[in-house]
Amino acid sequence: EPLSLAPESLEVSIDSARQCLHLKWSVHNLAYHQELKMVFQIEISRIKTSNVIWVENYSTTVKRNQVLRWSWESKLPLECAKHSVRMRGAVDDAQVPELRFWSNWTSWEEVDVQSSLGHDPLFVFPKDKLVEEGSNVTICYVSRSHQNNISCYLEGVRMHGEQLDPNVCVFHLKNVPFIRETGTNIYCKADQGDVIKGIVLFVSKVFEEPKDFSCETRDLKTLNCTWAPGSDAGLLTQLSQSYTLFESFSGKKTLCKYKSWCNWQVSPDSQEMYNFTLTAENYLRKRSVHLLFNLTHRVHPMAPFNVFVKNVSATNATMTWKVHSIGNYSTLLCQIELYGEGKVIQKQNVSVKVNGKHLMKKLEPSTEYAAQVRCANANHFWKWSEWTRRNFTTAEAAPSEAPDVWRNVKSVQGHCVVTLFWKPLSKLQANGKILFYNVVLENLDRPSTLKLLSIPAPANGTELTLDRCSYQIHVTANNSVGTSPASVIAVSGDPGNKEVEEERVKGTEDGFCLSWKPQPGDVTGYVVEWCERPGDPLCDLQWKNLGPNTTSTVVSSDAFRPGVRYNFRIYGISTERIPYLLEKKTGYSQELVPSDNPQVLMSNLTSYSFTLSWKDYAAESQPGFVQGYSLYLKSKAARCLPGSEKAVLSDDSICCKYKIDNPKQKTFVVENLQPASFYEFFLTPYTSVGEGPQGAFTKVTTPDEYSHI
């Protein structure tokens, strides 16, 4: 009987939280073991059975007495209105074409949640609804009182709705935004009484798909897959995310424990190709990303191990290491980097199966180095391993350069006192720790006479008292391995302090630019000598060696200070290694105004004149070259005398100024004065920068014409 293939035992249950109706039914009259395709037409009505709001055809394969299920999600919260459901069925199977017509409808199954609500005068639905931003949401209130006027507010803004029936009003919210993690607040309240109800609508940010999905293996046994989860949903507890890895070739699936990575055991059956789907899922939606790759192309080797630096000499060292195997036939490409003073100074690539070895050449003796190695799959490069690093220090070698030596010669009681200075060798020249310096004195008048002095480091000089003979002095630096080449300097019986005219030089920001005349005859080089702390007993003697073809140099130093006079001496070095003085230069890196004024004496006072005189004072101590003097004269006279001009002082007083532009002049006669008149004078030197400090004026009164009678 065809009509008997009808849906029976229809049950409807509800899931308020998800706003779902769940239908359960079965078809009883199928023959045993019979399996037919059927289609079920489902109708859902709201409030009245005549108001059908949903019709859907659901197709499935049916067995005898099998429980069939179908769910429907309502846009309207189920508490807002009564819903009714009915269905009918039809066979839709090629096996029985004659049965293709609808069965009778089932009776309407009524779902009325309102009847189970409490006795409160007002209810608002849905409760704790969770949606993604941009969704449309339907809200309603159910009122138990016809008299009360109910107003509903979304975040304090009144909403306008449609009345479903006298007790129910519905509000349609379009494109809801994410506001805050605690959700969106909706309140409904009655005009009369103190009835108020609130609900929270949880709006999450859109669930994004995972980014940067990638898988790799370090040992061909485990794949480590990583990804960046999409941005935070913006809600605290409502939206937990789950991540699932599915591999299509093996058909295996794993639920990931962590939200940004997952491990996958590699199949022992030598599966090479992997096709992963990573599915991120939350309550609201699923997002999937795919990745297809060959396992051997995704090898990220482990860091090299058993790394040693062996056979370390002064200039060579050998690095050895082992690599973790990544399969029987694979070759690893290893990269070696050598660091010196924090910079890469050598880089090399080496192919390795199991053991690696690399010789590092052209190293500096007694130097700290760091060597590091990392490896990658040579056949299919994916990623480098981590570096494994080793520090080592090369062995010492004999110093490679002669010390830079200079001397100062003084004649004391018929003896020659020679102070020797040398600069410490640079790290590069010393090739190890300098332990001592050897000074060998060779008397040129008695060549077989040698004297050896051994001076422990870190001394940078020594004092020798020699007789008037000529000597050649050899200085070497010594470390644990050997001796440096010798530096040779000669001292003749004549101290060689001939008189040389001193020339002025002007310093700049860059230093002092010194030049000299080239020397006729053979010179092996030049030396420029100066003190960095002139006036200080220790002086801090400095020198600069220059080649035989050099006739100028710039001397610069951070120690140069404004207002300090620096004296430079330029020596030629003869072929016999004897220094001789060529030129003297003196100057300031920056001149300043004079620091003080000379003491002035007045003499020869007459009715019409007086004479001023002042002592010469140490030019060395002046903060600039004195170019002359300014004499200021104050008097009652309105006009300035010949040879002077009007000047305004710092206190705005007016006086007359005489300019004395000869710095060697030490007397000055003030003439053309008036008898029995009061005058005041003040003398100050000036440099290229300006005058000295303004001091106190000295008072003087000329006698009257007849005072001598």
Epitope: D120, F123, D128, I179, N185, V200
Partner: antibody
Framework: DVQLVESGGDLVKPGGSLRLTCVAS????????MAWVRQAPGKGLQWVAN????????YYLDSLKSRFTISRDNAKNTLYLQMNSLKTEDTATYYC??????????WGQGTLVTVSS | EIQMTQSPSSLSASPGDRVTITCKAS??????VAWYQQKPGKVPKLLIY???TRHTGVPSRFSGSGSGTDFTLTISSLEPEDAATYYC?????????FGQGTKVEIK
């Protein structure tokens, strides 16, 4: 008449446990968020925990999460706060409160919890 | 956590005075702010929610305003029965937090 009545407050030693109970009446209990708020003697208000309508979501002050548990029994119109490993700084009056949403429109009279050795 | 800072911490005013209490949030809380009144020896009572909505039964002299980080509770004409401590509360982010309170005394 809408009412919340707390009980269970007591003097307890540090490290001890207490269970606070709140019985609701005069409204449909399952239709509201509920919470606990505390007030130390002479001090201000401090939110402790919240629970949603059916107890499926709970929210806590981070520093109390490991020691306090909020729960509800809608059939009995009752709210609970289980407090373990109590510390002297937990001494306060504990209020059972009803939430409109996250704002609190009905407050119980409070129950005093004293933690002292 | 979001800090809610109330000022002043206490004030004294005469009946009929206009009283303003401010609450500053350490970060944007939109309008998710409530105000409570607690009279001495009594339990707190909700006055305002969503920053400016007066709760049912609250006298119209109480009003709330503000959004973002700055909020104000105003009593337009102080009554003797308004002597109490007033608290603001934010419910924009967890944990929910209260201000430290402002004590209002009547001269």
């Amino acid at each position: 008449d809408v009412q919340l009545v707390e009980s269970g407050g007591d003097l307890v030693k540090p490290g001890g446990s207490l269970r606070l109970t709140c019985v609701a009446s005069g409204f449909t209990y399952s239709d509201y968020y509920m919470a606990w708020v505390r007030q130390a003697p002479g001090k201000g208000l401090q939110w402790v925990a919240n629970i949603n309508y059916d107890g499926s979501s709970t929210y806590y002050l981070d520093s109390l999460k490991s020691r306090f548990t909020i729960s509800r029994d809608n059939a009995k119109n009752t709210l609970y706060l289980q407090m373990n490993s109590l510390k002297t700084e937990d001494t306060a009056t504990y209020y059972c409160v009803r939430g409109l949403t996250w704002d609190f429109d009905v407050w119980g009279q409070g129950t005093l919890v004293t933690v002292s050795s | 956590e979001i800090q809610m800072t109330q000022s002043p911490s206490s004030l004294s005013a005469s009946p009929g005075d206009r009283v303003t209490i401010t609450c500053k949030a350490s970060q944007d809380v939109d309008t998710a702010v409530a105000w409570y009144q607690q009279k001495p020896g009594k339990v707190p009572k909700l006055l305002i929610y969503l920053a400016s909505t007066r709760h049912t039964g609250v006298p119209s002299r109480f009003s709330g305003s503000g959004s973002g980080t700055d909020f104000t509770l105003t009593i337009s004409s102080l009554e003797p029965e308004d002597a109490a401590t007033y608290y603001c509360q934010q419910y924009s982010r967890f944990p929910l937090t209260f201000g430290q309170g402002t004590k209002v005394e009547i001269k």
